[in-house]
């Protein structure tokens, strides 16, 4: 595999990771796929320091992160353990609210205008943040 030693153009380096901040919106799944096509993932917040860094760059705007419970338990897209990891939910969130009238509950997490997290309908077109780690060898699959 090959190692990424510096961030791509228009990405921001911070603590050995690269971040890209959208300025337009997509549904959570489309944002997730966007990041994957850039060999990245929706941002995974692992510390208060990283939370403050992301919050500074996105401002007071609803923004998707790489956290969802579409298959039951809450999961980070990169496999980071949710139960033991950093959390920054708004009070009384997540609540899997069904009262929005859009069908189903709320399965995708986003930063709210004050930076704290909320669960919301995954189809909402929010901004998003991609993250990729530096110095991590990218495993190229064998050719068929």
């Amino acid at each position: 595999g090959s190692e990424r030693t510096c961030c791509p153009v228009n990405w921001v380096e911070h603590e050995r990771s690269c971040y890209w901040f959208s300025r337009s919106g997509k549904a959570w799944a489309d944002a997730d796929n966007y990041c994957r096509l850039e060999d990245a993932h929706l941002v995974v917040v692992t510390s208060w320091e990283e939370q403050k860094f992301v919050q500074h760059h996105i401002g007071p705007v609803n923004t998707w992160m790489g956290l969802h419970d579409q298959n039951g338990p809450w999961k980070w897209v990169d496999g980071t353990d949710y139960e033991t990891g950093f959390k920054n939910w708004r009070p009384e969130q997540p609540d899997d609210w069904y009262g929005h009238g859009l069908g189903g509950g709320e399965d995708c997490a986003h930063f709210t205008d004050d930076g704290r997290w909320n669960d919301d309908v995954c189809q909402r077109p929010y901004r998003w943040v991609c993250e990729t780690e530096l110095d991590k060898a990218s495993q190229e699959p064998p050719l068929l």
Partner: antibody
């Protein structure tokens, strides 16, 4: 100068297989996702498949899922499309295309000349 | 999948004419809309990305506008080399990108 050169097309019977190749030059191949787009004779464009720069992430149109496999060899600057269980409706010119991401939108900024795949008995 | 519908499917025009091609999405796609030109026997070529941004090297007579569900491609003064088929493509739904059916611009 960016160049994409497809090869491997031809006549194949229904149920048969074919592997297309796309040789790339003029850019850092491993830094870009690559895609296949096809065009049936006299018809419009249809996205088929895409693969991320590292080759780790792949996606397919529903019409080819489970039958086609996209892959790449970054050491050879080459993109592939393995097509199995071919059907008459897969008959088309197949283009390889370089995908670029700008300001949150994806589009195809360079295309190959295409290779014709004909599925017929 | 998001459906893209172009109109008209074909049009006849003369050199120097101003023409407009429209593209409608089956749901809101914000500004995730690209335009391509294709000449017979050739590969498509990108003209406009993100609804209104002109791709490098494309003449300024081409312009794009719109957001949400309705978009237009305008050629301000049609040139002989502009007779071709034009396709819109949405890139909101990633990566199930879909194209319009095409608009053929012919010489009157």
């Amino acid at each position: 100068e960016v160049q994409l050169l497809e090869s491997g097309g031809g006549l194949v019977q229904p149920g048969g297989s074919l592997r297309l190749s796309c040789a790339a030059s003029g850019f850092t191949f491993s830094s870009y996702a690559m895609s296949w787009v096809r065009q049936a004779p006299g018809k419009g464009l249809e996205w088929v498949s895409v693969i991320s720069g590292s080759g780790v992430n792949t996606f397919y149109a529903d019409s080819v899922k489970g039958r086609f496999t996209i892959s790449r060899d970054n050491s050879k600057n080459t993109l592939y499309l393995l097509m199995n269980s071919l059907r008459a409706e897969d008959t088309a010119v197949y283009y390889c295309a370089k995908k670029i991401a700008v300001a949150g939108t994806h589009y195809f900024d360079y295309w190959g000349q295409g290779t014709l795949v004909t599925v017929s008995s | 999948d998001i459906q893209m519908t172009q109109s008209p499917s074909s049009l006849s025009a003369s050199v120097g004419d101003r023409i407009t091609i429209t593209c409608r999405a089956s749901q809101s796609i914000s500004s995730y809309l690209n335009w391509y030109q294709q000449k017979p026997g050739k590969a498509p070529k990108v003209l406009i990305y993100a609804a209104s941004s002109l791709q490098s090297g494309v003449p300024s007579r081409f312009s794009g506008s719109g957001s949400g569900t309705d978009f237009t491609l305008t050629i301000s003064s049609l040139q002989p080399e502009d007779f071709a088929t034009y396709y819109c493509q949405q890139s909101y739904s990633t990566p199930t990108w879909t194209f319009g059916q095409g608009t053929k611009v012919e010489i009157k």
